[in-house]
Amino acid sequence: MMTGTIETTGNISAEKGGSIILQCHLSSTTAQVTQVAWEQQDQLLAICNADLGWHISPSFKDRVAPGPGLGLTLQSLTVNDTGEYFCIYHTYPDGTYTGRIFLEVLESSVAEHGARFQIP
């Protein structure tokens, strides 16, 4: 039975040219995480694997940085980065947990800058 829950940064916005941290946390389960994948729509951005560590997709290498933790930092944001992002936790024995974040990249300085995700 899958008892875990994924907490995410939810809906966030950031300015064009800036950077943002995407963060998910899996809790309420003692399942062990073996891999965390980050996807934008159907495109793989990055994987953090228990054995191999981080792998950033070649097409995103210049603009994606691993961390903090199992999160992902997106840099040099463009309006085209607006959209859904998914963190996919592969765990044993529970299986797969998925969290969703919606990022809106704004042209103006009206955007709220995404701060590092913190649990109170």
Partner: antibody, heavy 119, light 113 residues
Amino acid sequence: EVQLVESGGGLVKPGGSLKLSCAASGFAFSDYDMSWVRQTPEKRLEWVAYISDGGYNTYYPDTVKGRFTISRDNAKNTLYLQMSSLKSEDTAIYYCARQILLRYYFDYWGQGTTLTVSS
Amino acid sequence: DIVMSQSPSSLAVSVGEKVTMTCKSSQSLLYSSNQKNYLAWYQQKPGQSPKLLIYWASTRESGVPDRFTGSGSGTDFTLTISSVKAEDLAVYYCQQYHSYPWTFGGGTKLEIK
């Protein structure tokens, strides 16, 4: 150089409380999961508490659940273990140990601090 | 809980000899999706804290001499020291990190004749 230095051990009466600390240096503390592992007088090793890198997840074995609380202050690079309702079987050397994200073995250990629970 | 059993509990060998110690788990430590065995070996010298030797059952930690070799899969694991040195005097522990609570074997004490 990775360093983990435990402190706070001592002699406590059964039912008493104590808080252990572990000062970390030589690495990015907030990028690592951490645990406390104890070694009994019989030299057996027992894992007693785990905390994730950002502090959002904590796990304990049944032997200490409800009595021990692990916490961390990433700004101070310090790990803590608050122990209450102590029993004689909690007597041990307590080590803090570092864990790489997604890898649950202990890649660095401190030198340990000794807790003795006795009346 | 997964029970880890080590044997022998102690052994005495001469410098230069080959040593083999075993660790058995009550459940398989092999995770099928990544084909990794979630088992580690530690060395604890007298008066010191434990030191990581081997993880994923067979991967040597950086800086560990190549005379130390981990092998095995599933429930049966072995730590081999190909040619013992006097400095290898220690207790060797296995640990499973496959599932909570993480558990250790009782240790194998290596003494030098």
